[in-house]
C-alpha cells in the first residue's frame, strides 16, 4: 500500500515547483535583459563607431573642402553622399561651374587642385542636367582635347572617346588648330564646338561624390 503524502509535503512540492518556474522566468528575463543590454551597447557602439568614423572622414575632407552638402542614401538610408558646397550633384558625381576665364590647360589645373577634372560627359541626361545651370551666352571648356590636331579626341580622365555618345554642333569639329572642346548654346540647342585651347573660357569641373 502506498503511503499517503502528507499535506505539508504536497505544499512543499508545489512551492518547489513554483520556485523552479519563477527561477526559470527570472533567469530568462535576466538573460533577455542582458541580451538586450548587450545588443543595445553593441548597437550603440556600432553606431557610435560609425559616427566617429564619419566625423573623422568629414574632418579629413574638411581640409580640402570647407563645407560639404550631404544627403542620406542607400537601401537603409545609412550612407551619406556628399558634394563640396556649392557644387551640384547628379547621380554619382558633383559639378562646379567656374566663371573664371582661363585657358584650357589652366582650367584643367584649376579643377585638379579641387580634386576634380574638367567635365567628362557620358550621357545625354548628364549633359541636360549640366546645361540647366549654364548661361546661354557663355561657352564652357569640357575635359575633351585633341592635342596633336590629328582628330584623336581624348577625355582628361582617360575615358574612351565614343563617337556615338558625342554632342557636337552640326559641322563640328572643323579645324585641326582648334584642339579643345567647349559646350555652348547655338541654333536653339546646347552642343560641343572645337576652339583654340589658349583662348580663355569659363569651365565645368566634375568629381566623384564623396561617400561617408
Amino acid at each position: 500500500m502506498v503511503p499517503e503524502e502528507e499535506p505539508q509535503d504536497r505544499e512543499k512540492g508545489v512551492w518547489w515547483f513554483q520556485l523552479k518556474v519563477w527561477s526559470v522566468a527570472v533567469v530568462s528575463i535576466l538573460l533577455l535583459c542582458v541580451c538586450f543590454t548587450v545588443s543595445s551597447v553593441a548597437s550603440h557602439n556600432f553606431m557610435y563607431s560609425k559616427t566617429v568614423k564619419r566625423l573623422s572622414k568629414l574632418q579629413e575632407y574638411q581640409q580640402y573642402y570647407p563645407s560639404l552638402t550631404c544627403v542620406m542614401e542607400g537601401k537603409d538610408m545609412e550612407d551619406w553622399s556628399c558634394c563640396p558646397t556649392p557644387w551640384t550633384s547628379f547621380q554619382s558625381s558633383c559639378y562646379f561651374i567656374s566663371t573664371v576665364m582661363q585657358s584650357w590647360t589652366k582650367s584643367q589645373n584649376n579643377c585638379s587642385v579641387m580634386g576634380a577634372d574638367l567635365v567628362v560627359i557620358n550621357t545625354k541626361e548628364e549633359q541636360d542636367f549640366i546645361t540647366q545651370n549654364l548661361k546661354i551666352n557663355s561657352a564652357y571648356f569640357l575635359g575633351l582635347s585633341d592635342p596633336k590636331g590629328w582628330r584623336h579626341w581624348q577625355w582628361v580622365d582617360q575615358t574612351p572617346y565614343n563617337k556615338n555618345v558625342t554632342f557636337w554642333h552640326s559641322g563640328e569639329p572643323n579645324s585641326p588648330d582648334e584642339r579643345c572642346a567647349i559646350i555652348n548654346f547655338r541654333s536653339e540647342e546646347w552642343g560641343w564646338n572645337d576652339v583654340h585651347c589658349h583662348v580663355p573660357q569659363k569651365s565645368i569641373c566634375k568629381m566623384k561624390k564623396i561617400y561617408i
Epitope: 584650357w104 590647360t105 589658349h198 580663355p200
Partner: antibody, heavy 121, light 111 residues
Amino acid sequence: EVQLVESGGGLVKPGGSLRLSCAASGFTFRSYGMSWVRQAPGKRLEWVSTISSGDSYTYYPDSVKGRFTISRDNAKNSLYLQMNSLKAEDTAVYYCARQIYYDYAYYFDFWGQGTTVTVSS
Amino acid sequence: DIVMTQSPDSLAVSLGERATINCRASESVSFRTSHLMHWYQQKPGQPPKLLIYGASNLESGVPDRFSGSGSGTDFTLTISSLQAEDVAVYYCQQSIEDPPTFGGGTKVEIK
C-alpha cells in the same frame, strides 16, 4: 619659300591712325593663324594681336584693345592691322608672324622683316 | 599675364665654349608632357628666328649645337659650342595661354 612682307609704317602724330599690311607668299595663307608682334627700341618683344585661320577669333592685349583691329583677306593673302588713337608708347617695329600650332598652343615659325611705326608730335 | 624672366641679361663666351641661358616663368607653362615654351634668336637689324619649340624640339635647319630643356617654370637654352654667327639676342616665349609673353632677352657675345 615662306615670305612675309610688312608695309604701312611711318611717322604719325599722337591720336593719329595707321594701317599696316602684311603680304604673305610661299604657303597656303588661309590655313594659318597670324599675329602681329612689336618691338619698341631696346625693349622685349610684345605680342599685339592674333587672328585665327578662319577669321573666327581675334585677340588683343589690354594695352591695344579697343584701339587696334586685326583683319585678314584670304583671297589676297594679306594680313592687316588698323591702329587708331596712337600713343607715343606704340612706337616700335611691327612684325607680322605666322603661327604654328603645337599641342595646346602655338609658336611663331616665320616672321617678316618688320615695319617701323613712330608716334611723335 | 605670365611673366618671363631671363638670366643672365648678357653673356660673353669664348668661341667653342658652352653658353647657357635660363628662362623662368611666373607660373607653370607645362601641361602633362606638353611644355609650351619656345626660343628665338634675333640678330641686329633682323626679325626673330625660331630655334626651339616645345622646350626641346629643334626647328628644322637649326644647327644641333642648339638644344633646349626644362619643364614647369624653369627652362634652359644651351649652345654647346659657340660659333661667331651665334652672336645675337635670345628670347624665350610661353604660349600656354593668351597673351603669349616673351622674356627680356639675353645678349650673347664673344669673349
